[in-house]
Structure formats: structure tokens, C-alpha cells
Amino acid sequence: RDCAEVFKSGHTTNGVYTLTLPNSTEEVKAYCDMEAGGGGWTIIQRREDGSVDFQRTWKEYKVGFGNPSGEYWLGNEFVSQLTNQQRYVLKIHLKDWEGNEAYSLYEHFYLSSEELNYRIHLKGLTGTAGKISSISQPGNDFSTKDADNDKCICKCSQMLTGGWWFDACGPSNLNGMYYPQRQNTNKFNGIKWYYWKGSGYSLKGTTMMIRPADF
């Protein structure tokens, strides 16, 4: 069950819940946003204060890391399995250092299995964080510091830090280096969402959340 199921079962308070996949005993702890946009959102990524190192290995991005109450990555394997069982939407919520907020909403999101390096698939972009997708389309394989699956000679994950669906290297990286206020401009390896804030701006906060499309 995901956060949408948790919500429907009567738990309507934000917080960390234990989720499971259908036909599986494997459990994962995730933060559920039960308030935003009707609730039922499973948070798959959060950046807010730089407390967690996101320059991690393939295996760490596969199983997840961090603290579900704070900064964390839920795990590519869980997200892949979840998003291949039914149709999910992806909402990416962004905060800058000047108090502005924006979002990108994709009406269909899923990750391929590990066989294809958790390649990202996205359709139907709306929202305020840019009319063009800052995640390259068609989607690319996921890369980490020890798994160079991008399309650049430069090894994007090592150069820009963090695991992401790099192209060569592409217009976004929400898992880049966390830079504090007044150190967040002209940073090529920061937390980037190009079609909202440009190439050198490193964001204050990001949340990636998913929910079944028929919620």
C-alpha cells in the first residue's frame, strides 16, 4: 500500500507511515503528505537543509537513504515497482531562497526496472516551474557516482554530484549539492531546475511526490 491507500483507510495526518508493495512483505518507511492537493501523496524525495549527503552509490539509491521526516530518497526499486502497478502522477514542489514556490506536475510517471537502470518516463507537464520539462525527455537512465549511464563524456553524477536521470548532463538535478543562502548562485553542481530558476541557481527546498492518477 502507498500513502493514497493509507489516506483512504482513514489516516489523514501528515507523517511517516510504513508502506508495502502488493504481493510483498517488504516494508519501507515513507513520509505521507495528507494535506496538499487532497492528500494521499507518497514523498519520494525531499531536500530542505543539507543534512543528508546525496552523493550516494547505485545500491543506496536503489534501496533509499536518509530520514523520512527530513531529507531522504525513498528508493528507486520501491518506486519502480509501485509505479508499474498502476498509473501515477508526479508532483515536484520547489522553493527558492527568496520565498517563492513553484511546482511541476506530470500526469503520468513511472520508472523502468533496474534492468534499464530505473529509466524515467514522464508525460503531460503542467505547473508553474516552467513550460518545458526540466527532466530531459524522452527520459534517461538513472546515474550515480559509481554508475555512469549518462550521455556525457564528463560523468555527470561525479561532476554535478548526486544520483539523477542525467542526459548530457541536462536541465535538472534535484539531488545536487545543497548550498546555503547567499552561496546558492553560480553553482553548476547545486540543486537545479533550469526552466524555473536557470542554470546556476541552487534551490532551498524540493519535494518529489507521487499519487495514483485515479485518486
Partner: antibody, heavy 120, light 107 residues
């Protein structure tokens, strides 16, 4: 420099088994995925199988699935291909190739190959 | 499976010529394309990956381009050592598949 040296090729009868080896040197073997690719006499290249850097994932071409098994011993810097239930159409030069990363599905270095002939 | 079709299947050219080999995929492969060179009795040599990235040590007369289903390998000025067979390879999905090869001969 990167070196990949295959061995174990032989002439065998249909239905029999054979194990190929690929000895790797000049790089950190345990950090790279590895592939087997084959080339039938006078024909083009055919991908056979991949094994991830740590042996956690293995994928095969349909033509060999269920008959061939790819494996590796990172302590010995060696890649293997166990070939069972061999068929005449498996006759080819078998080469190992290093994946560009742990799982990128493209190659940067190849071995010279070892010839497998399946004939009655 | 994704079919890769190379053209021409063979080509005669002279030293100094500019040569283009094309590769067409049966479906879009989002630039997950590599090129190899093979000489008789030798191991294939990797030239290009991700459509246009030169492998380390590959001379700059080689270049690649393309998108979607159509890709090209260009040799800007043929050198004597460039006469060989060239293969394209898609790695967008499994199974990994190759083109049938283009044999480049001396005119």
C-alpha cells in the same frame, strides 16, 4: 592497459556443454559490468549476455536463455560463460567485452575471442 | 527486438575521402547508440557511444550524429588504417542489437 583474454573454446557435439573463461587485467574488474558477444563465421555481431559488476543482475539474449549462464569471480578477475545444450547455430567466436560502467549496456574494451564449434 | 539497419553494406573509398555510414533503428532509441570498428581477425574497437561521444583514444576524424531512429558515423578524412568493417549498436533496451555491418574498402 586493459586486457581481456578468452579461453575454453573447443569443438563439441550438439547437446554437450562447454565453459568459457575471460581473464581480465589492467583495471578494477569488480567495478565494471561484463558482457559476452559472439560472431558466427562470416556473420555480424550478436550480444549474448551481461552480468553486473557485483553479479547481482544477469540478462540474456532469447537465443541462449535457459541454456547459457554468465557468472564472475571478482576475486579471480575472471568472467565465465557456462554453455549447456549446445546447438550447431551456437558456432561462433565468443568475445568478452567490458561494460562502460556497471550496467550501461555499451562496451569500451573487447577481447580477441575464442572459437566454439558445435558439430556432429 | 529492435532491428538496426546499416547502409551501405559495403563502400569503396580513397584515402582522404569523407565517408558517411548510416544506421536506422526500427524504433526510436533516444541516442542510445554506439559505433565499433572491426578489422579481420581482430577484436572490435569501440569508437563512439551515446551517438556522438568519442571513446578515449579515438582520433578526431571520427564523429557521430543523429536522433530518434536515424544515426550517422562520419569519417572526415580517411586514413589507411580506417579501412575496416563498422557496426552500430543500440543499447536502448534489451536485447542489445547490432547493425549488420558496413565494409569499408580501398578504392
Amino acid at each position: 592497459q586493459v586486457q581481456l583474454v578468452e579461453s575454453g573454446g573447443d569443438v563439441v557435439q550438439p547437446g554437450r556443454s562447454l565453459r568459457l573463461s575471460c581473464a581480465a587485467s589492467g583495471f578494477t574488474f569488480s567495478s565494471y559490468g561484463m558482457h559476452w558477444v559472439r560472431q558466427a563465421p562470416g556473420k555480424g555481431l550478436e550480444w549474448v549476455a551481461i552480468i553486473w559488476y557485483d553479479g547481482s543482475n544477469k540478462y540474456y539474449a532469447d537465443s541462449v536463455k535457459g541454456r547459457f549462464t554468465i557468472s564472475r569471480d571478482n576475486s579471480k578477475n575472471t568472467l565465465y560463460l557456462q554453455m549447456n545444450s549446445l546447438r550447431v547455430e551456437d558456432t561462433a567466436v565468443y568475445s568478452c567485452a567490458r561494460d562502460f560502467s556497471i550496467s550501461s549496456r555499451h562496451f569500451d574494451y573487447w577481447g580477441q575471442g575464442t572459437l566454439v564449434t558445435v558439430s556432429s | 527486438d529492435i532491428q538496426m539497419t546499416q547502409s551501405p553494406s559495403s563502400l569503396s573509398a580513397s584515402v582522404g575521402d569523407r565517408v558517411t555510414i548510416t544506421c536506422r533503428a526500427s524504433q526510436a532509441i533516444n541516442n542510445y547508440l554506439a559505433w565499433f570498428q572491426q578489422k579481420p581477425g581482430k577484436a572490435p574497437k569501440s569508437l563512439i557511444y551515446a551517438t556522438s561521444n568519442l571513446q578515449s583514444g579515438v582520433p578526431s576524424q571520427f564523429s557521430g550524429s543523429g536522433s530518434g531512429t536515424d544515426y550517422t558515423l562520419t569519417i572526415s578524412s580517411l586514413q589507411p588504417e580506417d579501412f575496416a568493417t563498422y557496426y552500430c549498436q543500440q543499447y536502448y533496451i534489451y536485447p542489445i542489437t547490432f547493425g549488420q555491418g558496413t565494409r569499408l574498402e580501398i578504392k
